[in-house]
Interface confidence: low
Amino acid sequence: VQNSCDNCQPGTFCRKYNPVCKSCPPSTFSSIGGQPNCNICRVCAGYFRFKKFCSSTHNAECECIEGFHCLGPQCTRCEKDCRPGQELTKQGCKTCSLGTFNDQNGTGVCRPWTNCSLDGRSVLKTGTTEKDVVCGPPVVSFSPSTTISVTPEGGPGGHSLQVL
């Protein structure tokens, strides 16, 4: 003979010694019917705020307040948003590895520094985890016996400069 608790709907609880489906009391929920107890609803407080309020059939869902982000399944922890120079990983905020940077607050991923040499430019300022490399002007390389024509401002005559 089937126990009547098996027919209970979500939002109810049922005790086998008294197989009657009863509604979950306030601030509790049951997502599966026929359980002997309803679960206590999660309270979102402190660094948490309610994303979804508790109902008799679903637990509350929390999210983190401004300036913090969730960690863990179902947002079990709030961690301060990543600073510039960091990126968010599954383990939380991690400092950008050497050669990468993130200049954004709270968001973004670490991106590689600009390779100045690809454009034939020098490095003016080394990059940091927060800032990209600053490239200088193109590096001028003279080949042997290059002739440079120099025309003084306001003067029509050019001077030829032999670089040996």
């Epitope: 120079g85 050497l98 300022k125 080394t126 940091t128 927060e130």
Partner: antibody, heavy 120, light 107 residues
């Protein structure tokens, strides 16, 4: 010849603002790639990096002190400055300024340091 | 922040001795480590940068080695003028951090 010299108040009281000046010669903070850094050393303890200022007025601060530090420069004099607000006895230290080498981001020339005592 | 642990904190050696000072980083800093020398009442002086590049004017008895997390400054033959405090600096990541220093004395 590159030289740097720090100057400051010597002694000040808790909650006051510490103003430090680094007067340098032999290089210009308007030269691309150059910077000046401030570092401190409490008596008998290790060195602590505080802040950098670069030729283009870009600034870097130690995150643990960021809200109390302000670094600035005057290229015409030429000088770099550091302000530390709301000082405490823990800020008692020798304060150094140093030049940052272009293309490598490390300090090559340092000043002699200036002793600052915070006492009530 | 990356912690830099320097050892020993105090060292007594004789003229002509081979002296080694170690610096250990709490995480990989590649080769971005400098060594500085500070004599009493003087400004710190850059000896080595990026582990083993010697600053101009530094005597060849000084050398640097290591990579990753473990670094060494070696003085091949200690001279009286080498009496000073030596400290390391990592500039791999921000904030840059220093070792606690090694005070070197003559026996």
């Amino acid at each position: 010849q590159v030289t740097l010299k720090e100057s400051g108040p010597g002694i000040l009281q808790p909650s006051q603002t510490l103003s430090l000046t680094c007067t340098f010669s032999g290089f210009s903070l308007s030269t691309d790639g150059l910077g000046v850094t401030w570092i401190r050393q409490p008596s008998g303890k290790g060195l602590e990096w505080l802040a950098n200022i670069w030729w283009d007025d870009d600034k870097d601060y130690n995150p643990s002190l960021k809200n109390r530090l302000t670094i600035s420069k005057d290229t015409s004099n030429p000088q770099a400055f550091l302000k530390i607000t709301n000082v405490d006895t823990a800020d008692t230290a020798t304060y150094y300024c140093a030049r940052i080498v272009p293309n490598s981001g490390h300090e090559d020339y340092w000043g002699q340091g200036v002793m600052v005592i915070v006492s009530s | 922040d990356i912690q830099m642990t320097q050892s020993p904190s105090f060292l007594s050696a004789s003229v002509g001795d081979r002296v080694t000072i170690n610096c250990k980083a709490s995480q990989n800093i590649n080769r971005y480590l400098n060594w500085y020398q500070q004599k009493l009442g003087e400004a710190p002086k850059l000896l080595m940068y990026n582990t083993n590049s010697m600053q101009t004017g530094i005597p060849s008895r000084f050398s640097g080695s290591g990579s990753g997390t473990d670094f060494t400054l070696t003085i091949s033959s200690l001279q009286p003028e080498d009496v000073a405090t030596y400290f390391c600096l990592q500039h791999n990541s921000w904030p840059r951090t220093f070792g606690g220093g090694t005070k070197l004395e003559l026996k």
